[in-house]
């Protein structure tokens, strides 16, 4: 970090490594939740309008696709993979595309992925050929 | 000599505007996303916005977004931050930034270069 930037205790926003390189946060896809039509295909668009600058440089890219008898949702945010979301650790964050895997949530059906490119969050990939794991 | 020149900071009531500049200088700027950082007092770094070299597709935090606007002349290696509707949590010193598109970390702790920073403060 520059001598005239004041390093701040407890900062969260900045991550540095050990030679004080500076990490740059990351472009998602930031919509929150929104009705989508994505449903039995290989892979979707998000239709997600808005690239938003991630609010700590250690958030990834997140896409939650869900199915219920009422509707189909896509949900597309920036989060901290050292933290659950939606009580799933984000196992895959290190990925540069977001390959969806199926998690058990009763009475939906609930795909998740994360990954670390920008605006990879667009594009959600289901199709079985990327998936080398299996389904929690 | 890779340098970044910010001005435009001051003195501002909550509600109003400034155009910060970022003049830069000993580097190839198309070749560079440019951001807009920045440190309230006592504070971590916040990133506020940024632009891409070419087609100046443009990214903000959700905290600026449809307040502030980023824009770049490449003819005169400047980045500029339009900032409306200022308000009291926007006070902080503004510094510009650059970095390779794609690339994770900076070279250095340097960030690839800083500016010096401009103050801003929004205060009546």
């Known amino acids: 970090i520059p001598p005239h930037v004041q390093k701040s205790v407890n900062n969260d926003m900045i991550v540095t490594d050990n030679n004080g390189a500076v990490k740059f946060p990351q472009l998602c896809k930031f919509c929150d939740v929104r009705f989508s039509t994505c449903d039995n295909q290989k892979s979707c668009m998000s239709n997600c309008s808005i690239t938003s600058i991630c609010e700590k440089p250690q958030e990834v890219c997140v896409a939650v696709w869900r199915k219920n008898d009422e509707n189909i949702t896509l949900e597309t945010v920036c989060h901290d993979p050292k933290l659950p979301y939606h009580d799933f650790i984000l196992e895959d964050a290190a990925s540069p595309k977001c390959i969806m895997k199926e998690k058990k949530k009763p009475g939906e059906t609930f795909f998740m992925c994360s990954c670390s490119s920008d605006e990879c969050n667009d594009n959600i990939i289901f199709s079985e050929e990327y998936n080398t794991s299996n389904p929690d | 000599e890779v340098q970044l020149l910010e001005s435009g900071g001051g003195l501002v009531q909550p509600g109003g505007s400034l155009r910060l500049s970022c003049a830069a200088s000993?580097?190839?700027?198309?070749?560079?996303r440019m951001w807009w950082v920045r440190q309230a007092p006592g504070k971590g770094l916040e990133w506020v916005s940024?632009?891409?070299?070419?087609?100046?597709?443009?990214y903000y935090a959700k905290s600026v977004t449809g307040r502030f606007t980023i824009s770049r002349d490449n003819s005169k290696n400047t980045l500029y931050l339009q900032m409306n509707s200022l308000r009291a949590e926007d006070t902080a010193v503004y510094y510009c930034?650059?970095?390779?598109?794609?690339?994770?970390?900076?070279?250095?702790?340097?960030?690839?270069?800083w500016g010096q920073g401009t103050l801003v403060t929004v205060s009546s």
């Open positions: 930034a650059k970095q390779i598109p794609g690339r994770k970390w900076t070279a250095n702790s340097r960030f690839d270069y």
């Open positions: 000993g580097f190839t700027f198309t070749e560079y």
């Open positions: 940024a632009i891409e070299p070419i087609g100046n597709r443009t």
